[in-house]
């Protein structure tokens, strides 16, 4: 194709010379998911007063959402690349059942909920390629996940709204911690 005026074709590189690095790709993937979470949180907070609620502890007792702890090696003090990467992958695998729960919880953002779920699966694949010690990663038991899902879906409306809010908030925090840690790797 002809080069527009003022442009010099020999300076313009072909697109295949510009792939993202593995780190850039992971960074982008996490930010993509965080953007989706942000949209879902907006709908949740507009729909109910969960975001201002002080009764979170009641619902949190039913949930075992992954959290970063000092021992996971993801914080600046005591940072350990391998331990941290295992924690991030394990945590994401544990979040998958909760992301499945979110699938029927949104009206106007149904597509966003799907995007968060799908892009998390892709992120797990990227990170598994990066991990050297895949044996240390424990995959959640499908039977346990299935019964957890049934239990969550059987909750009353208030608890379901609160669960949705807590999942989104915890997942956001987990991803933000992961993003900071991965940038050190």
């Amino acid at each position: 194709a002809p080069v527009p005026p003022g442009e010099d074709s020999k300076d313009v590189a072909a697109p295949h010379r510009q792939p993202l690095t593995s780190s850039e790709r992971i960074d982008k993937q996490i930010r993509y998911i965080l953007d989706g979470i942000s949209a879902l949180r907006k709908e949740t907070c507009n729909k109910s007063n969960m975001c201002e609620s002080s009764k979170e502890a009641l619902a949190e007792n039913n949930l075992n959402l992954p959290k970063m702890a000092e021992k996971d090696g993801c914080f600046q003090s005591g940072f350990n690349e391998e331990t941290c990467l295992v924690k991030i992958i394990t945590g994401l695998l544990e979040f998958e059942v909760y992301l499945e729960y979110l699938q029927n919880r949104f009206e106007s953002s149904e597509e966003q909920a799907r995007a968060v779920q799908m892009s998390t699966k892709v992120l797990i694949q990227f990170l598994q390629k990066k991990a050297k010690n895949l044996d240390a990663i424990t995959t959640p038991d499908p039977t346990t996940n299935a019964s957890l899902l049934t239990k969550l879906q059987a909750q009353n409306q208030w608890l379901q709204d609160m669960t949705t809010h807590l999942i989104l908030r915890s997942f956001k925090e987990f991803l933000q911690s992961s993003l900071r840690a991965l940038r050190q790797m």
């Epitope: 953007d35 995007a115 694949q125």
Partner: nanobody
Framework: AVQLVDSGGGLVQPGGSLRLSCAAS????????MDWYRQAPGKQRELVAS???????MLDDSVKGRFTISRDNAENTVYLQMNSLKPEDTAVYYC???????????WGRGTQVTVSS
């Protein structure tokens, strides 16, 4: 696959303006995160501006207050409005689309921006 056509580059004097456009083919534009990168000769590629699916924008510190990024989902196009251009903005500007569903990135061929008196 998504195909991107970036355009709008050219030769401009310091202090001038340009508006870059990046048109995407396909029906998945609304789920793509869009970026503008630039690469000056002999330098590392750098991320200039990003616009997320939600419309949230991010600009590199070096262009804040001068550049703006926007998207038109109906037109499958992302724009980079560049004002108060400086000689150090001279580079090839690349449009990039990122699909989080698949983790795939798609690149335009690049459009040359030259800021010189």
């Amino acid at each position: 696959a998504v195909q991107l056509v970036d355009s709008g580059g050219g030769l401009v004097q310091p202090g001038g303006s340009l508006r870059l456009s990046c048109a995407a083919s396909g029906s998945i534009f609304s789920r793509l995160a869009m970026d503008w990168y630039r690469q000056a000769p002999g330098k590392q590629r750098e991320l200039v501006a990003s616009i997320a699916v939600s419309g949230t924008t991010m600009l590199d510190d070096s262009v804040k207050g001068r550049f703006t990024i926007s998207r038109d989902n109906a037109e499958n196009t992302v724009y980079l409005q560049m004002n108060s251009l400086k000689p150090e903005d001279t580079a090839v500007y690349y449009c990039m689309a990122f699909d989080g569903y698949t983790g795939s990135d798609y690149w335009g061929r690049g459009t040359q921006v030259t800021v010189s008196s």
